[in-house]
Interface confidence: low
Amino acid sequence: HNTTVFQGVAGQSLQVSCPYDSMKHWGRRKAWCRQLGEKGPCQRVVSTHNLWLLSFLRRWNGSTAITDDTLGGTLTITLRNLQPHDAGLYQCQSLHGSEADTLRKVLVEVLADPLDHRDAGDLWFPGESESFEDAHVEHSISRSLLEGEIPFPPTS
């Protein structure tokens, strides 16, 4: 899996989207987990509703929310009041039994100074946020991690 970078501004909300094949993952609950170190386990942060039919309902764990558009095939995670310690590598997962398939690897970057990215909105397509109920959510910037880039800095 390639890693997709999502950048957000400290103190604001960041929305992460994980597209998936709605046919293949039909009937499966989803989860958002945080990778603990390069080779470490992925620690569950929040998962979708226990009843798959209610996956569209937003579930919160602290400042992190998850909602699943099972027809369209998009899992959306909202990180509210983004803080520097939220930066790191995460995964969107599809759950089946005791197994979990990785839908997307995500590197969250937290930008300290919003003025440095005041033109970031030019990169966003407003229509993409229309189905979400949080009107205050800030638009995120995402890109794929370039070949050779590493999500974890080398340890000295």
């Epitope: 094949d21 709605s22 046919m23 293949k24 039909w26 009937g27 039919l53 027809l71």
Partner: antibody
Framework: QVQLVQSGAEVKKPGSSVKVSCKAS????????MNWVRQAPGQGLEWMGR????????NYAQKFQGRVTITADESTSTAYMELSSLRSEDTAVYYC????????????????WGQGTLVTVSS | DVVMTQTPLSLSVTPGQPASISCRSS???????????LHWYLQKPGQSPQLLIY???NRFSGVPDRFSGSGSGTDFTLKISRVEAEDVGVYYC?????????FGQGTKLEIK
Amino acid sequence: QVQLVQSGAEVKKPGSSVKVSCKASGYAFSSSWMNWVRQAPGQGLEWMGRIYPGDGDTNYAQKFQGRVTITADESTSTAYMELSSLRSEDTAVYYCARLLRNQPGESYAMDYWGQGTLVTVSS
Amino acid sequence: DVVMTQTPLSLSVTPGQPASISCRSSQSLVHSNGYTYLHWYLQKPGQSPQLLIYKVSNRFSGVPDRFSGSGSGTDFTLKISRVEAEDVGVYYCSQSTRVPYTFGQGTKLEIK
């Protein structure tokens, strides 16, 4: 148009293995489940298993677990079904069949079938 | 596994007359997503099976409108309003709500 073309008939000895191929064309091979179904002479249809070529995810019927292996080669859009430890009861026509995909999530019916491959197990 | 039971196992019909095949499953075929994955296939003599009806009542492309499917839960029916000579073959109901997918024993339709 969608086409599934299977390999030719095989005659095998009991205890041996057979590998049947199914070459797909006319659709996105990687993102549709491919099934294998068999039909013994004069009998009904029996589902053996399926594969999602996009990532190799497989499910098998309990009856064939441990004896059947379904694989897929995305580069050639070809699915394979290998059945080992053959016995005379495995004599059948083996079909590959794609799962229907129209609206998102409205799937799980086999809309296109290969022409079938007759496997005869005889000493 | 879900057991699919078809009745009758054979049917002899005069052209132009209706025909009906029943299919019963050993457990409900309603998926957790609300859909019911019950399908009907026809296998004509010497041919591969072909899809007729998917998800209880949806005719597959190219299937004549004389074919219709109905039912819910565990009881389903395939109806042919006016049988034609080309309809001969073996009809199978099948479920894909649960893995492993299973088929009925088949109903052989003959023309009188």
